[in-house]
């Protein structure tokens, strides 16, 4: 019996089934839906998590204005195709042979087409803007305390290297967290900003992906930080390719998470 066999669970992903039949007799945890073995010492990729979810038995301005190329996930949930490493395949298709291209966080970045649609490469999302509105409080949070707490959260809970949290902006009641991670910056073993953002999004919604941990209890100097709305913008290293109709109308059609 190895220690892993005595406690064969996945701390970082509750949407797994674990058994002591991995290499070397170690505990091996498979993601629901795909059956792929996941590394339970770090975050599971968003693609495998989405697949598991679909298979399982929602004045001087300091705030960032998302660029014209920012993407919002308007398409909601879908059952994605993941590559052998668990990343999103560049081209996604549904059961009716409608296909589209996605970025590294699985968000559609082209108009929908048919099976002839080509997606040459998986385009990296290098900048994520998490836009939050917190519930009314007695007073505004201290910006530096808020900044420190959110950076601690991403470092300790999601194991994201601090250098990838580019900035925390605050203009009551809006908080913005900027995550930046270029292809060249991401070393082997680094948590992907897209995965960290997805875990954070699920935590904020009260749908924690962590095994057995309590939900997210965010506090700034003891004061609860309760989020009532989140909006996440994704910026890719190569701008998306939508028709003009989409750019003028669809861009502002946001999904709000309550």
């Amino acid at each position: 019996h190895t220690a892993a066999q005595d406690n064969c669970t996945c701390p970082t992903n509750k949407m797994t089934v674990c058994s002591p039949d991995g290499p070397g007799g170690r505990c091996q945890c498979r993601a629901l839906g795909s059956g792929m073995a996941v590394d339970c010492s770090t975050l599971t990729s968003k693609c495998l998590l989405l697949k598991a979810r679909m298979s399982a038995p929602k004045n001087a301005r300091t705030l960032v204005r998302p660029s014209e190329h920012a993407l919002v996930d308007n398409d909601g949930l879908y059952d994605p195709d993941c590559d052998p490493e668990g990343r999103f395949k560049a081209r996604q298709c549904n059961q009716t042979s409608v296909c589209w291209c996605v970025n590294s966080v699985g968000v559609r970045r082209t108009d929908k087409g048919d099976l002839s649609l080509r997606c040459d490469e998986l385009v990296r999302t290098h900048h994520i803007l998490i836009d939050l509105r917190h519930r009314p409080t007695a007073g505004a949070f201290n910006h530096s305390d808020l900044d420190a707490e959110l950076r601690r959260l991403f470092r300790e809970r999601y194991r994201l290297h601090p250098k990838f949290v580019a900035a925390v902006h605050y203009e009551q009641p809006t908080i913005q967290i900027e995550l930046r991670q270029n292809t060249s910056q991401k070393a082997a073993g680094d948590v992907d900003i897209g995965d960290a953002a997805y875990y954070f999004e699920r935590d904020i919604k009260g749908e924690s992906l962590f095994q057995g941990r309590g939900g997210l209890d965010l506090r700034v100097r003891g004061e609860p930080l309760q989020v009532e709305r989140t909006l996440i913008y994704y910026l890719d290293e190569i701008p998306p390719k939508f028709s003009m109709k989409r750019l003028t109308h669809h861009h502002h059609h946001h999904h709000h998470h309550h």
Epitope: V17, S19, D21, G22, G24, S34, A37, P57, P84
Partner: antibody, heavy 115, light 107 residues
């Protein structure tokens, strides 16, 4: 020692259903996957699906999703597979096997579908 | 699904010779490949797990190698009882699949 013992041979008519059992012993039944594999006469091995007895989470080969049902009774350490709407090409030896690398196999259950 | 292609389909060798059986996966599966021997009328028997891990009770003449997409089962010196059908199987992701088999026959 680990053993998987399967139920006996079955002869069924087309359109009928068959249920094969696999009784496990010699290990903790709930901690390992049980897989079902079949082999038609003179053919290779075909994976039907797998069940995790601890929580009865089951995964099916797309080919069998509409006709196969895998279950597990933890109280008697036994896994089952039921195949419905049988056809003549379902004639095969059905095996249960343990773990992701199929380290232990049942002796096989011959299912013959014939009118 | 991941397709496993075994070669050759049939291998004719004599006792004492070295046998090399190949299994190729349609995509990268790391080391999630396992090898089985099956004799007529019997259930398959696990020989090698995770590409190269040996199995208790299996003679040391059986060894495995490879990672990614190309895998090899080697029998260093064939014994009369080794003539059988050999299958590879992957456990990378669902659905699990088997190769079509290599029949090892006496020359």
């Amino acid at each position: 020692q680990v053993q998987l013992v399967q139920s006996g041979a079955e002869v069924k008519k087309p359109g009928a259903s068959v249920k094969v059992s696999c009784k496990a012993s010699g290990y903790t039944f709930t901690t390992h996957w049980i897989h079902w594999v079949r082999q038609a006469p003179g053919q290779g091995l075909e994976w039907i699906g797998t069940i995790f007895p601890s929580n009865a989470y089951a995964v099916y080969n797309q080919k069998f999703r509409d006709r196969a049902t895998m279950t597990a009774d933890r109280s008697i350490s036994t896994a089952y597979i039921e195949l419905s709407r049988l056809r003549s090409d379902d004639t095969a030896v059905y095996y249960c096997a343990r773990a992701s690398y199929f380290d232990y196999w049942g002796q096989g259950t011959t299912v013959t579908v014939s009118s | 699904e991941i397709v496993l292609t075994q070669s050759p389909a049939t291998l004719s060798l004599s006792p004492g010779e070295r046998a090399t059986l190949s299994c190729r996966a349609s995509q990268n599966i790391g080391t999630s490949i396992h090898w089985f021997q099956q004799k007529p009328g019997g259930a398959p028997r696990l020989l090698i797990k995770y590409a190269s891990e040996s199995i208790s009770g299996i003679p040391s003449r059986f060894s495995g190698s490879g990672s990614g997409t190309d895998f090899t089962l080697t029998i260093s010196s064939l014994e009369p009882e080794d003539f059988a059908v050999y299958y590879c199987q992957h456990s990378h992701s669902w659905p699990f699949t088997f190769g079509q088999g290599t029949k090892l026959e006496i020359k």
